[in-house]
Interface confidence: medium
């Protein structure tokens, strides 16, 4: 029987099944000391673990969510560009969200996140899953910032509904403010969706990456008197 270090909760791990199979694999490797499994077999086990974790990641539908992420980012980008065109043509004040330009740099980040998620869904390598996870965590933080920015923006900008034609506008000032507030609201909604998708993809990415056995596995052979002789075997990533 074995004891091993877990990197995630038992119910999230495929180690149990994989480690059980290791009992049948224990063979004496010449000169390696008793009770030590062959390194070749360890690599096979690790490959088997990664396969299971790959499946966990793919359960999160990274390709579908990545496409949705890109579509939302493109919608947000088009909203932002439209808002900028409407706002800058008006002689007066415009929403903070336009001034900060979140819709531009936020959308670029979400497009990168989505692209990495799609790539990780097509070719599930650790590098791509890691990249996707990193970008989606960043996107989650950005989406939270965007939600805050847009909420403040809407609150402040609604104040100008009272004052808007103080500065005047060749078109109906209140109409312009209403359009900008509506679009700001839409960007807020899209930011909430982006946050949900980024968090979801991060969660599935984390299940795959954070649960990878990158630590030390302690093999304890069945004959307990030999326990002291069993070395600590690191499981190298493949």
């Amino acid at each position: 029987h074995q004891t091993y270090r877990r990197h995630c909760r038992p119910e999230e791990s495929t180690f149990s099944a994989a480690m059980t199979t290791m009992q049948g694999m224990e063979q004496a490797t010449p000169g390696a000391g008793p009770g030590v499994p062959q390194l070749g077999n360890m690599a096979v086990v690790h490959s088997h673990l990664w396969k299971g974790l790959q499946e966990k990641f793919l359960k999160g539908e990274p390709k579908v969510l990545g496409v949705v992420q890109i579509l939302i980012a493109l919608m947000s980008l088009s909203m932002g560009i439209t808002m900028m065109c409407v706002a800058f043509s008006a002689y007066g004040h415009y929403p903070i969200s336009v001034y900060i330009g979140y819709t531009i740099w936020g959308s670029v980040m979400f497009i990168i996140s989505g692209s990495l998620s799609i790539a990780a869904g097509i070719r599930t390598t650790k590098g791509l899953v890691r990249g996707s996870l990193g970008m989606n965590i960043t996107s989650s933080v950005l989406a939270v910032s965007a939600i805050l920015i847009n909420t403040i923006s809407l609150t402040i900008y609604s104040f100008y509904h009272r004052y808007c034609n103080y500065y005047g506008n060749p078109n109906n000032c209140h109409g312009t403010v209403s359009i900008l507030m509506g679009m700001d609201g839409m960007v807020l909604l899209l930011s909430v969706l982006e946050f949900c998708i980024a968090v979801s993809l991060s969660a599935f990415g984390c299940k795959a990456i954070c649960c990878t056995p990158g630590g030390v596995v302690l093999i304890i052979p069945s004959n307990s008197h030999m326990a002291e002789a069993a070395p600590l075997t690191p499981l190298n990533e493949v």
């Epitope: 034609n165 103080y166 005047g168 109906n172």
Partner: antibody, heavy 114, light 112 residues
Framework: QIQLVQSGPELKKPGETVKISCKAS????????LSWVKQTPGKGLKWMGW????????TYANDFKGRFAFSLETSASTTYLRINNLKNDDTATYFC???????WGQGTPLTVSS | DVVMTQTPFTLSVTIGQSASISCKSS???????????LSWLLQRPGQSPKRLIY???KLDSGVPDRFTGSGSGTDFTLKISRVEAEDLGVYYC?????????FGGGTKLEIK
């Protein structure tokens, strides 16, 4: 072309009420707020406040709260300045102007004298 | 309210000479939308004021390019490169950054 045309000169006694009009033309009336500016003889310009021509909400400068009232007649593209309980120091020329001070009325001289 | 301080009070120039008027505000006139709401107006004798410059340096239509506005934050200047007889009158700076706009005290331009 854009024009702001004000009502003619006024001569009033202290304690009376005056209503000065400012008729706008040449642009969409509800798209630009209108300000009222007071100029006493030989003195500078003093902003009295403005009215949102879309919502009709007036905003008054601190020195012009109480006896002063701005109102609208949107259908006639006209804004009004009403001064109640006139005092001698209300004697001045009153201008209406678009809030960005880009267009001005010709001014309405008001004389308050007993 | 924002206080606008104009200097000098009176400016005497000969025709063809240049003239410069300064305007200082008690707080920055740069708004969060990136625009600086400062205008220059001219009130000729017996007339209503006329806006010459808006957003610090933009000339209103029909205003000769002899007039130039400059400055940022709290310090602004109006320059008239070659003064003409029609330029005499009182010049005012105006701020519209808050919803209680204010005017400078005025600078009277006289012809020597």
């Amino acid at each position: 072309q854009i024009q702001l045309v004000q009502s003619g000169p006024e001569l009033k006694k202290p304690g009376e009420t005056v209503k000065i009009s400012c008729k706008a033309s040449g642009y969409i009336f509800t798209s630009y707020g209108l300000s009222w500016v007071k100029q006493t003889p030989g003195k500078g310009l003093k902003w009295m406040g403005w009215i949102n021509t879309y919502s009709g909400v007036p905003t008054y400068a601190n020195d012009f709260k109480g006896r002063f009232a701005f109102s609208l007649e949107t259908s006639a593209s006209t804004t009004y300045l009403r001064i109640n309980n006139l005092k001698n120091d209300d004697t001045a020329t009153y201008f209406c102007a678009r809030s960005l001070v880009d267009y001005w009325g010709q001014g309405t001289p008001l004389t308050v004298s007993s | 309210d924002v206080v606008m301080t104009q200097t000098p009070f009176t400016l005497s120039v000969t025709i063809g000479q240049s003239a410069s008027i300064s305007c200082k505000s008690s707080q920055s006139l740069l708004y969060s939308d990136g625009k600086t709401y400062l205008s220059w107006l001219l009130q000729r004798p017996g007339q209503s004021p006329k806006r010459l410059i808006y957003l610090v340096s933009k000339l209103d239509s029909g205003v000769p390019d002899r007039f130039t506005g400059s400055g940022s934050g709290t310090d602004f200047t109006l320059k008239i490169s070659r003064v003409e007889a029609e330029d005499l009158g009182v010049y005012y700076c105006w701020q519209g950054i808050d919803f209680h706009q204010t005017f400078g005290g005025g600078t009277k331009l006289e012809i020597k």
